[in-house]
Interface confidence: low
Amino acid sequence: VQYAPRDVRVRKIKPLSEIHSGNSVSLQCDFSSSHPKEVQFFWEKNGRLLGKESQLNFDSISPEDAGSYSCWVNNSIGQTASKAWTLEVLYAPRRLRVSMSPGDQVMEGKSATLTCESDANPPVSHYTWFDWNNQSLPYHSQKLRLEPVKVQHSGAYWCQGTNSVGKGRSPLSTLTVYYSPETIGRR
């Protein structure tokens, strides 16, 4: 009796452990049986066709390769799809930047919040803040709140984010604190 390929599934061949950015990765499209035996494979990610081999190989995987993959196996009787298989790529914090709210120019006496933004998997677990002299500041959360902000707070700041894979740092961002009209009037 002839039938379409059965029990199609995606299997990770390598690495044996979790996938880190830069790893060589191989996925295999497996099926239990097919009659007739002549088959064709299709690989797809998020709706985009990638290849027609039984294996899908990445020489050096990147975070952009993460996503939902599936394969189909075809024979002359029909086409059978695997369940979607999620490829997760772990990587150190990257694209770090310091954003400032309400902006990078704030009047003294108000509040300013500096946020260390990043892209990381797993998410950043530890933040370190530094000033323009590369002095570490006693803040270890994603947000650094200055209230009331003083003119002496003017300067450049940067942050470092750390996760289980590694660490990354942001470029410098400059905060300018200007005198209030009251202070100027007293002078």
Partner: nanobody, 118 residues
Framework: QVQLVESGGGLVQAGGSLRLSCSAS????????MGWHRQAPGKQRELVAS?????????KYADSGKGRFLISRDNNKNILFLEMNSLKPEDTADYYC??????????WGRGTQVTVSS
């Protein structure tokens, strides 16, 4: 080279029906497996139904379409059909025709849009 053109998509109310067609031209004598796939916005492309070219024309359906969808073909005119009944909003997607030839090359159509309103 096989060229595929889908038609029959459109806007339909929930519970309604549509009949999609996929017309093949080119070296159609070599086609041995035909299927309909669909892709909803932001979702994975998925197999809806497939049919073999052999005399039996063995058919296969995804669970989502069993009992509601019917795949068929007219070998003389090289047309593949998908009859869709009792449509649901979750059937909203672009529907694509895939044909696989005896040398196991594959050809896709450009798709036809199906929108099911509630």
């Amino acid at each position: 080279q096989v060229q595929l053109v889908e038609s029959g998509g459109g806007l339909v109310q929930a519970g309604g029906s549509l009949r999609l067609s996929c017309s093949a031209s080119g070296i159609t004598s070599s086609i041995n497996s035909m299927g309909w796939h669909r892709q909803a916005p932001g979702k994975q492309r998925e197999l809806v139904a497939s049919i073999g070219r052999g005399g039996s024309g063995s058919t296969k359906y995804a669970d989502s379409g069993k009992g509601r969808f019917l795949i068929s073909r007219d070998n003389n005119k090289n047309i593949l059909f998908l009859e869709m009944n009792s449509l649901k909003p979750e059937d909203t997607a672009d529907y694509y025709c895939l044909e696989v030839t005896t040398d196991l090359s594959s050809y896709w159509g450009r798709g036809t849009q199906v929108t099911v309103s509630s």
